[in-house]
């Protein structure tokens, strides 16, 4: 998270750290007792590693009573996700057991109405991704409020040049932005999950390259079918 600040500890009980061999890889969001939603590209290079999900965490390193690491029973990338595109960049991870819910671990309601968020709406993004261009990784969860950017502006030739489909949305990236390591994390607008941080290798914090987020409402049928 660039241009953000430390989050209030455990105020985002839906927040997950997707880990590879014990190290933070991507963000994720608890959407059901046994399911975490993240980005498909996160697992592209994880073929031989052990994937786990950390819930109830604020600090990645410090002991916290609510923290628990879950093994992954099943990883379900969206069937249309491909390594070379940002489209359909969603991944559902089934935990080895139902998460123990409490004040610091709770699923987040996700948007089912397939309607664009109004431009200018301030949405909350959180993650353990890098906090500066030198690549410093934070130990504690960071967050930032970002305004939603209209699709027409985001699709300008100087910006993302038509790559933003109706299944994607954009947020401003003028010094405040999501960045490497935040992929798979939640974009929360008005207390509801609206988007998931895509995991391309986009430059961060440059206003001409807005943040790209997968609109969960556009994938409601797929999410429901996997969770069923």
């Amino acid at each position: 998270i660039l241009g953000g600040r430390e989050a209030e500890a455990h105020a985002r009980p839906y927040m997950a750290s997707v880990q590879l061999n014990g190290a933070h890889l991507c963000g994720g969001v608890l959407v059901a007792e046994q399911w975490v939603l993240s980005a498909a590209h996160c697992l592209e290079d994880a073929a031989d590693g052990k994937v786990q999900v950390l819930l109830g965490a604020h600090s990645l390193s410090q002991p916290e009573p609510s923290k628990r690491l879950y093994d992954v029973l099943r990883a379900v990338p969206h069937p249309d996700s491909q390594p070379d595109t940002i489209d359909h960049d969603l991944l559902l991870l089934q935990l080895s057991e139902k998460a123990t819910l409490g004040p610091a671990v709770r699923p987040l309601p996700w948007q089912r109405v397939d309607r664009d968020v109004a431009p200018g709406t301030l949405c909350d993004v959180a993650g353990w991704g890098i906090v500066n261009h030198a690549g410093r990784r934070p130990d504690s969860l960071q967050h930032v409020l970002l305004p939603v950017l209209d699709r027409a502006t985001c699709n300008r030739r100087t910006h993302h040049d038509g790559a933003i489909t109706e299944r994607l949305m954009c947020a401003e990236s003028n010094r405040r932005d999501s960045c490497k390591g935040d992929s798979g994390g939640p974009l929360v607008c008005g207390g509801v999950l609206e988007g998931v941080v895509t995991s391309g290798s986009r430059v961060c914090g440059n206003r001409k390259k807005p943040g790209i987020y997968t609109r969960v409402a556009s994938y409601a049928a797929w999410i429901d079918s996997v969770l069923a």
Epitope: E8, R12, V117, P119, L122, R176, G190
Partner: antibody, heavy 121, light 106 residues
């Protein structure tokens, strides 16, 4: 203590412009969005827009586009709102407001002292 | 934009009574905020995210609701509760306020 101190009352003529200020103290000014709210007669509250003091990004309620312009001066931790082409409809109390917490449920948790603007010939 | 309608516009009740005011949204919102304002003062945050009391708010206040219908309840009214209460949605830009409920003490 977090405070938003606004400039004093303004009496302005129709067609003129006015610029009101909001000086923040007790927190890091550039960390948080600054919003502006109009309270007109009948006590109706209308959100005007916000500005991010960190990067200047702003958003306006369509109703106030062309009427209000938001700006900031980082060096003095002050936010400004200019209102132009004033009419009697613009007579109101104007508040700056911010959220300086870090939970995902942001709201207007600190309000300015308010600036009364009266438009009269 | 989302329009918020508050009712009643004026509520008159006696100390010790339980009172409830409502806020209806023209389309569904996930949470609602409430503010208290007394004459000559700026609004104060009162309840955020539907049911969480802002700092310093007495526990006789509570908030509830979902979708398009939200309410603020005072379990035992006190004289100091006389004020106007506004609901506000933050789901979508432009952020909108209700017209307010003026609470008077008999």
């Amino acid at each position: 203590e977090v405070q938003l101190q606004q400039s004093g009352p303004e009496l302005v003529k129709p067609g003129a412009s006015v610029k009101i200020s909001c000086k923040a103290s007790g927190y890091s000014f550039t960390d948080y969005y600054m919003h502006w709210v109009k309270q007109s007669h009948g006590n109706i509250l209308d959100w005007i827009g916000y500005i991010d003091p960190y990067n200047g990004v702003s958003s306006y309620n369509q109703k106030f586009k062309g009427k209000a312009t938001l700006s900031v001066d980082q060096s003095s931790s002050t936010a400004y709102m200019e209102l132009r082409s004033l009419t009697s409809e613009d007579s109101a109390v104007y508040y700056c407001s911010s959220y300086y917490g870090s939970s995902p449920y942001w709201y207007f948790d600190v309000w300015g002292t308010g600036t009364r603007v009266t438009v009269s010939s | 934009q989302i329009v918020l309608s508050q009712s009643p516009a004026i509520l008159s009740a006696s100390p010790g009574e339980k009172v409830t005011m409502t806020c209806r949204a023209s389309s569904s919102v996930s949470y609602m905020h409430w503010y208290q304002q007394k004459p000559g003062s700026s609004p104060k945050p009162w309840i955020y995210a539907t049911s969480n009391l802002a700092s310093g708010v007495p526990t006789r206040f509570s908030g509830s609701g979902s979708g398009t219908s939200y309410s603020l309840t005072i379990s035992k009214l006190e004289a100091e509760d006389a004020a106007t209460y506004y609901c506000q949605q933050w789901s979508s830009n432009p952020y909108t306020f209700g017209g307010g409920t003026k609470l008077e003490i008999k």
